[in-house]
């Protein structure tokens, strides 16, 4: 089990699930990665989402040093993102094709934060309520940025775990 | 329905500091952000500070290194912390929600005047 604040994770476990989630998000969108979205935000909005940054100790120096400081912020950027895709944003309507990965996509999420998180504390999902766009329009751009993002924190998570799996596996 | 109940506004000499507070009921989540807004006299209003569910911080330039905005542990009360105030910041002050990754806010508060005086 991977662990913040606690013992060393099970790297190959991770990155061979994170890789499964880079290719859910993008077959989720695979157009997304054709658009710049900063063009569509700004300085404030791009706060709004999880990021892995150069302070969260998820170079290979921090990881070395002490991997539990990056691993708490890849499960907190996990948990918001499986909320997010659990949300109205994603329930509601237009209503996503039968065949959308993006159910998956979820499940693939909460596997992943379960494998990051603390023995013997269990994540509860739940639906979340959210001031959701009313026009269906919005509500799709909305997901486009989501997973437009999500897509961006999976590949910085998934050489992560790439890395450790080499590097730092027993 | 999202309600938001500013305080704390007042009048204050410059260099004096202030903390506002916005108060949120309704269906606010963490994929909400909440923002600090003023509307000087004569001026469009401007955002000044916002900060997410995540509790990732927003600054205005001519803010920084002097507001702080946070919230309570329910997530339910903002505040803004105003240090060193100057007399440009004699504003209503604004407490606003919006949906992340959008840049409108959707609910706004009737506003909490502040005068800072030279």
């Known amino acids: 089990r991977a662990v913040p604040g606690g013992s060393s994770p099970a790297w190959t476990q991770c990155q061979q699930l994170s890789q499964k989630l880079c290719t859910l998000a993008w077959s989720a969108h695979p157009l997304v990665g054709h658009m710049d979205l900063r063009e569509e935000g700004d300085e404030e909005t791009t706060n709004d989402v999880p990021h892995i940054q150069c302070g969260d100790g998820c170079d290979p120096q921090g990881l070395r040093d002490n991997s539990q400081f990056c691993l708490q912020r890849i499960h907190q950027g996990l948990i918001f993102y499986e909320k997010l895709l659990g949300s109205d944003i994603f329930t509601g309507e237009p209503s996503l094709l039968p065949d959308s990965p993006v159910g998956q996509l979820h499940a693939s999420l909460l596997g992943l934060s379960q494998l990051l998180q603390p023995e013997g504390h269990h994540w509860e999902t739940q639906q979340i309520p959210s001031l959701s766009p009313s026009q269906p329009w919005q509500r799709l751009l909305l997901r486009f940025k989501i997973l437009r993002s999500l897509q961006a924190f999976v590949a910085v998570a998934a050489r992560v775990f790439a890395h450790g799996a080499a590097t730092l596996s027993p | 329905e999202v309600q938001l109940v500013e305080s704390g506004g007042g009048l204050v000499q410059a260099g004096g500091s202030l903390r506002l507070s916005c108060a949120a009921s309704g269906s606010i989540s963490e994929f909400n952000v909440i923002g600090w807004h003023r509307q000087a006299p004569g001026k469009e209003r401007e955002l000044v500070a916002s900060?997410?569910?995540?509790?990732?911080?927003y600054y205005t330039g001519s803010v920084k290194g002097r507001f702080t905005i946070s919230r309570d542990n329910a997530k339910t009360t903002v505040y803004l912390q105003m240090n060193s105030l100057k007399p440009e910041d004699t504003a209503v002050y604004y407490c606003a929600v919006r949906q992340i990754l959008r840049r409108e806010y959707d609910y706004w508060g009737q506003g909490t005047q502040v005068t800072v005086s030279s």
């Open positions: 900060i997410t569910g995540h509790d990732s911080t």
